[in-house]
């Protein structure tokens, strides 16, 4: 039960995280005009990865896309790439994890396959989360650098009466959404990896313990596997489903001295 819960929760957390990464990538508020210690303007500027916007006092908002690829800063391109890679990996991870979920049965998929898929999706979520966190952090670092540069020469001009006020930008809402979303995706991925360990069948074939009772040779295998008569069959530790509603997460019954006839 704990494994299913961990896997399910990991999936949900990752799903929320990836939705957040997508939202952050699409948001226009990656950087917003710094209002502190600045001349009060009747317009508010904010910028995203894809366009920059201006909101006037009336609420009228005008956005302009960055219709150039080569003219954009390399750092911005890198952030875009990291976020897109994060989204793509996350989306693939989600797709893989759906089929890996224990509560979903697809044909006669073995537990080892589900475990591998869970691990794969978990790793994808971890990398996706790291990409998002890296992307947001790179952008934040870029903002901090530019902020102090523009503070150093906030008023640029010809030294005369005419001055140009540089617009300073600070962290926008998208950065916080990105950090949280990346973190959630990362946590979800770790949970999937943990769930994978619980899903994977034991590698070692347990030595069958034979009990000699009134001439019958009955081998018991630990771990909730059905006992096989003799040593010939079921030696590969394959689960034999008995059609009941039991899950593998149920308390496993190990042979006790009262088990044999």
């Amino acid at each position: 039960m704990a494994v299913t819960a961990c896997q399910g929760l990991g999936f949900v957390v990752s799903l929320i995280g990836i939705a957040g990464i997508i939202a952050a990538t699409c948001m226009d508020q990656w950087s917003t005009q710094d209002l502190y210690n600045n001349p009060v303007t009747a317009v508010f500027n904010y910028q995203g990865l894809w366009r920059s916007c201006v909101r006037e006092s009336s609420g009228f908002t005008e956005c302009r896309g960055y219709f150039t690829l080569l003219g954009l800063p390399a750092m911005l391109q890198a952030v875009r790439a990291l976020m897109i890679v994060g989204i793509v990996l996350g989306a693939i991870g989600l797709l893989v994890s759906i089929f890996a979920l224990k509560c979903i049965r697809i044909g006669s998929m073995e537990d080892s396959a589900k475990a591998n898929m869970t691990l794969t999706s978990g790793i994808m979520f971890i990398v996706s989360g790291l990409c998002a966190i890296a992307g947001v952090s790179v952008f934040a670092n870029m903002l901090v650098t530019n902020f102090w540069m523009s503070t150093a020469n906030m008023y640029t001009g010809m030294g005369g009466m005419v001055q140009t006020v540089q617009t300073r930008y600070t962290f926008g809402a998208a950065l916080f959404v990105g950090w949280v979303a990346g973190g959630l995706t990362l946590i979800g991925g770790v949970m999937m990896c943990i769930a994978c360990r619980g899903l994977a069948p034991e590698e070692t074939n347990y030595k069958a313990v034979s009990y000699h009772a009134s001439g019958h040779s009955v081998a018991y295998k630990p771990g909730g596997f059905k006992a096989s008569t003799g040593f010939g069959s079921n030696t590969k530790n394959k689960k034999i489903y008995d059609g009941g509603a039991r899950t593998e997460d149920e308390v496993q019954s190990y042979p006790s001295k009262h088990d044999y006839v």
Partner: antibody, heavy 119, light 113 residues
Framework: DVQLVESGGGLVQPGGSRKLSCAAS????????MHWVRQAPEKGLEWVAY????????YYPDTVKGRFTVSRDNPKNTLFLQMTSLRSEDTAMYYC????????????WGQGTSVTVSS | DIVMTQSPSSLTVTAGEKVTMSCKSS????????????LTWYQQKPGQPPKLLIY???TRESGVPDRFTGSGSGTDFTLTISSVQAEDLAVYYC?????????FGTGTKLELR
């Protein structure tokens, strides 16, 4: 058709108070920011106050800050300007002005109400 | 505060003449975010409230005759009337609508010869 009608002007003693009103019609008052602008006799225009549509943002120039208070009653489509500690330099025609939908412009002006501060 | 300086303070013209008036601001009114200049021009006829003519330095308000043209960027702006009509006699004000406090120019009075 947009209409802005100011009222409440008149003769006031220096140090006295006055409350101006502006009745708006012909547009959705609650969706627009509003300004007060004044013009001293034979002088230029001077911006006095701004209030956003939901009253969340209010600005004044230093010349009136602490003495004038702008407010609005959206259900009644009315804009107010409470003036206290009036001085002779506050003598002017006071205009109620609507903030336009774009460009931060003052697109519609009332006819104004005259305030004279004199002893 | 932003200082708006208009010149000349008055202009005497004849009907049909081309008129140009200047407005200079102490700081740039160009917003880098949308590359728009937040400068507005108003016309005030005697005994009337001002009327909006031009916003964003060069965009004509609807209903304003096309003989009125706004130009300029940053700190230097110009209002041009291509062919002055009798009804254009008024005081023209430029206004900074970028920085608070919002400030008006001293005005340019257009008079007929």
């Amino acid at each position: 058709d947009v209409q802005l009608v100011e009222s409440g002007g008149g003769l006031v003693q220096p140090g006295g108070s006055r409350k101006l009103s502006c009745a708006a019609s012909g547009f959705t008052f609650s969706s627009f920011g509003m300004h007060w602008v004044r013009q001293a006799p034979e002088k230029g225009l001077e911006w006095v106050a701004y209030i956003s549509s939901g009253s969340s943002t209010i600005y004044y120039p230093d010349t009136v800050k602490g003495r004038f208070t702008v407010s609005r009653d959206n259900p009644k489509n009315t804009l107010f300007l409470q003036m206290t500690s009036l001085r002779s330099e506050d003598t002017a025609m006071y205009y109620c002005v609507r903030l336009g939908p774009r460009g931060n412009v003052m697109d519609h002006w009332g006819q104004g109400t005259s305030v004279t501060v004199s002893s | 505060d932003i200082v708006m300086t208009q010149s000349p303070s008055s202009l005497t013209v004849t009907a049909g003449e081309k008129v140009t008036m200047s407005c200079k601001s102490s700081q740039s009114l160009l917003n880098s975010g949308n590359q728009r200049n937040y400068l507005t021009w108003y016309q005030q006829k005697p005994g009337q409230p001002p009327k909006l003519l031009i916003y964003w330095a060069s965009t004509r308000e609807s209903g304003v005759p096309d003989r009125f043209t706004g130009s300029g960027s940053g700190t230097d702006f110009t209002l041009t009337i291509s062919s002055v009509q009798a009804e254009d006699l008024a005081v023209y004000y430029c206004q900074n609508v970028y920085f608070y406090p919002l400030t008006f120019g001293t005005g340019t009075k257009l008079e007929l010869r």
